[in-house]
């Protein structure tokens, strides 16, 4: 299953399959997730080691048993790949690292006014993988405001150095935020020239294209079909690049197919997995296991659940079957692709779905009246769980926020439905940033069921929580995916990085905002909060957040929206925007429903019809 816990001061011994430099453990974990054989990783921050060569070292590891011995190493961080973790799988990495220079091939230098502008330039340059920016206070005046666009053979820095007044980060192309746009066309009987960066075997051009999209240096590809004249080159997928970023030439060639990486597509990238099953095809590779199962779909599920399995073949040969079950061959290879593809066999083959974003779990969890005042504009995909709850009577308007917690579930505040309990009048918009982008053609979700907490009473602050079941499940994308829920009764975690988001008023007597706003707000203890609200009872099922001096808060229109906190690189839904005295007033923190206290209720209500809780446990 999915394991998200990080082990501090621990290093996995042995099992190395690759190593690289990464700026933090989260980026190292992402590289492990996308590496075909990596199950575990260990990361050495700069503070953890004196050896300059090993600083920022990210070590990717495999293990036949799925685990390795941990040795104590001060400062080291270790963890698991996020394969099998559904919507948490993403190649998108937005963080900017201060005081760090990520080295690589510098191919473009320009003057820009901010690190955000530098990141945008990298994202809009086809060859840029990461960048470094020298700030206004950099020690050498001639380098100040320099934005260096970079690439490397592996897509990660060739070295990382601690350097004052330098900020570094990665391209946001994997976040589907590139302005370049992409070529969706696939060209028959055409071979591209230029430099081959990798060679893999694939059953069709679509798989070849997806592999190209997620390969750090692939810009375009040529695929040799299974009827290509040279037998040894059949089903070969050549991943390619060029200095210019486009093919310098193409040659008409029977039975070849060429196309482009889709990494520069805006707003939508293909999933990093291949779900199609290929009948009459055998995939060869290293044998991991052989099991008898009923049907090719069960074989694929078995492969997906066995984390080291990369692809499979389900044999229908009479000698491989007994009763209704046949042999399911679970296989793997060094590069994650079959080592041999044979056609016209009595088998059906396909790939593990361990890297699919979607998963089929409806709620993500972990084991172990109000709007934003003093906030700033959010950017695309920054808060992909945020939804807008709108009411359509004669006109249509935004009333509340909400959080997507599963394919078919939204968590919000019960008071949003005060006087409006009819599900037909509500429209739920997900995957949006600007309310002005909503037109009559914008898709929205309708409500199948509103589940208000049984102890909630109108105009009381207690149990201000409600679940919405959507009529149809939503697909997950970079812009629309769920937030994980905290552990039941989560009291031990100290959250220091918490944010509130919404489209609500920007001042007490204001109006709904167009662009989704965000504000970083510290949590306040319940004792402190109770002192500020002596006329109200602040219960242990509430959580408060705010600055003593005020100025930043949620406000009208933010109700029901998320209070999220980042811990160990993972966002969790800590609170639901509920109430407060005015907005952003001095010594009047915002009050939020404490989600951890309602985990039993949430899980009970989101149980599937067969009585099994459809939830994801990453830890």
């Amino acid at each position: 299953g999915c394991l998200t816990q990080l082990y501090e001061n621990a290093f996995f011994r042995g099992g190395d399959v690759a190593s690289m430099y990464t700026p933090n453990a989260q980026y190292c974990q992402m590289r492990c997730t996308f590496h075909p054989r990596c199950l575990l990783f260990s990361f050495l921050p700069a503070s953890s080691i004196n050896d300059m060569e090993k600083r920022f070292g990210c070590f990717l590891k495999d293990s036949v048993t799925g685990t390795l011995p941990k040795v104590h190493r001060t400062g080291a961080v270790s963890g698991h790949s996020l394969k099998q973790c559904g919507h948490q799988i993403s190649a998108c990495h937005r963080d900017i690292y201060k005081g760090v220079d990520m080295r690589g091939v510098n191919f473009n230098v320009s003057k820009v006014s901010s690190v955000e502008e530098c990141q945008k330039r990298c994202t809009s340059n086809i060859r840029c993988q990461f960048f470094s920016y020298a700030t206004q206070t950099f020690h050498k005046a001639e380098y100040r405001n320099n934005c260096l666009l970079k690439y490397s053979p592996g897509g990660t820095p060739t070295a990382i150095k601690v350097l004052s007044n330098v900020e570094s980060g990665f391209s946001l192309k994997p976040c589907a935020l590139s302005e370049i746009g992409c070529h969706m066309n696939i060209f028959q009987h055409l071979a591209f020239s230029d430099v081959d960066v990798a060679r893999v075997l694939t059953p069709d051009a679509f798989v070849c294209r997806t592999i190209c999209t997620y390969h750090p240096n692939c810009l375009f590809f040529t695929f040799y079909t299974n009827v290509w004249k040279i037998e040894s080159q059949r089903n070969v997928c050549l991943l390619k690049t060029s200095e210019s970023g486009t093919p310098s030439s193409s040659t008409p060639q029977e039975n070849t197919i060429s196309g482009y990486s889709l990494l520069t597509c805006k707003r939508t990238l293909p999933e990093p997995c291949h779900s199609k099953i290929y009948p009459g095809v055998d995939f060869g590779g290293e044998e991991l296991n052989v099991t008898f199962v009923k049907g090719v779909n069960v074989c694929q599920e078995t492969c997906t659940k066995m984390i080291r399995c990369q692809f499979f073949t389900y044999s229908l040969l009479p000698e491989d079957c007994k009763e209704e079950k046949c042999k399911c061959f679970l296989r793997l290879s060094m590069d994650g692709s079959p080592t041999r593809i044979a056609y016209g066999t009595q088998g059906s083959s396909g790939y593990s779905l361990r890297l699919c974003n979607t998963g089929d779990n409806s709620v993500c969890t972990t084991k172990t009246s109000t709007r934003i005042v003093g906030g700033t504009n959010s950017s695309w995909g920054e808060w992909p769980w945020q939804v807008s709850l709108q009411v359509k009577l004669t006109a249509q308007r935004h009333l509340c926020g909400g959080s997507l917690i599963g394919h078919q579930w939204v968590l919000t505040a019960a008071h949003c439905f005060d006087g409006l309990p009819l599900q037909d009048v509500w429209r739920i918009y997900s995957g949006i940033l600007n309310l002005s982008d909503i037109t009559k053609d914008t898709p929205f979700s309708q409500i199948k069921e509103i589940i208000i907490h049984q102890n909630y009473k109108v105009s009381e602050g207690n149990h201000d929580i409600a679940l919405i079941k959507l009529q149809a499940p939503l697909n997950y994308t970079e812009f629309q995916k769920p937030i994980c829920l905290p552990s039941k009764g989560d009291t031990s975690t100290i959250y220091t990085n918490c944010w509130v988001t919404g489209w609500g008023f920007s001042k007490e007597k204001g109006e709904i905002q167009n662009i989704l706003q965000k504000v970083n707000i510290p949590l306040v203890t319940n004792e402190e909060c109770q002192k500020r609200y002596q006329d109200y009872k602040i219960t242990q099922r509430m959580v408060c957040a705010g600055y003593k001096e005020g100025g930043k808060d949620a406000c009208k229109g933010d109700s029901g929206g998320p209070l999220v906190c980042k811990h160990n690189g993972m966002w969790r839904l800590v609170g639901i925007t509920s109430w407060g005295e005015g907005c952003a007033r001095r010594e009047q923190p915002g009050v939020y429903t404490k989600v951890a206290e309602y985990m039993d209720w949430i899980l009970e209500k989101t149980q599937s019809s067969d009585g099994k809780a459809q939830m994801q446990s990453p830890a």
Epitope: M184, N185, F206, N226, I257, S275, K276, Y343, Q346
Partner: antibody, heavy 119, light 107 residues
């Protein structure tokens, strides 16, 4: 010129049999996966059956499974569809089609042959 | 089996009009989607493969888009020879299934 030419259609009684042929020319027939697709009068297209180049793997729509058999003779560049236990609902124009390798689209179609099942 | 639903089932348009036909799959089919044109008494003809790629010899006024479950065929400026029935077809899984067709008629 790449071409597919069907033959063998006609009028047959319910329960009867018929064998359709599809002669290919202008391309290396033995390299391509071939399929049969049918269209009932005034209706849409329905995939019927497919066969790999070597003939080692065949596939059928549920509606014809156990009654129809697809086969090929690569030495004669010909595709066949043996239809047994014919029913009135099998009445249709039958097209043979070539599948583009690596893309899974029917790029070349024959002109079709009409099969009428009626008493 | 994957169901393919086309809309509208028929439409009337004039020469020069922009025409859009949609096709929805009952489950995600990635980009494994093809479009065909069929004229009365003739065999179907491949127009678009892989959701958006134009088959050789097909005029550039035809274009396709979409991925996952929702797909669109667009004719930017309808010509007299474009009056026909259009079918979408998924090749993601067997049985390969077609939409019920959209008949484009002269207004």
């Amino acid at each position: 010129e790449v071409q597919l030419l069907e033959s063998g259609g006609g009028l047959v009684q319910p329960g009867g049999s018929l064998r359709l042929s599809c002669a290919a020319s202008g391309f290396t027939f033995s390299s391509y996966m071939m399929h049969w697709v049918r269209q009932a009068p005034g209706k849409g297209l329905e995939w019927v059956s497919g066969i790999y180049p070597s003939g080692g793997w065949t596939d059928y729509a549920d509606s014809v499974k156990g009654r129809f058999t697809i086969s090929r003779d690569n030495s004669k560049n010909t595709l066949y569809l043996q239809m047994n236990s014919l029913r009135a609902e099998d009445t249709a124009t039958y097209y043979c089609a070539r599948l583009v390798a690596g893309l899974d689209a029917f790029d070349i179609w024959g002109q079709g042959t009409m099969v009428t099942v009626s008493s | 089996d994957i169901q393919m639903t086309q809309s509208p089932s028929s439409l009337s348009a004039s020469v020069g009009d922009r025409v859009t036909i949609t096709c929805r799959a009952s489950q995600s089919i990635s980009s494994y989607l093809n479009w065909y044109q069929q004229k009365p008494g003739k065999a179907p003809k491949l127009l678009i493969y892989a959701a958006s790629s134009l088959q050789s010899g097909v005029p550039s006024r035809f274009s396709g888009s979409g991925s996952g479950t929702d797909f669109t065929l667009t004719i930017s400026s309808l010509q007299p020879e474009d009056f026909a029935t259009y079918y979408c077809q998924q090749s993601y899984s067997t049985p390969r299934t077609f939409g019920q067709g959209t008949k484009v008629e002269i207004k």
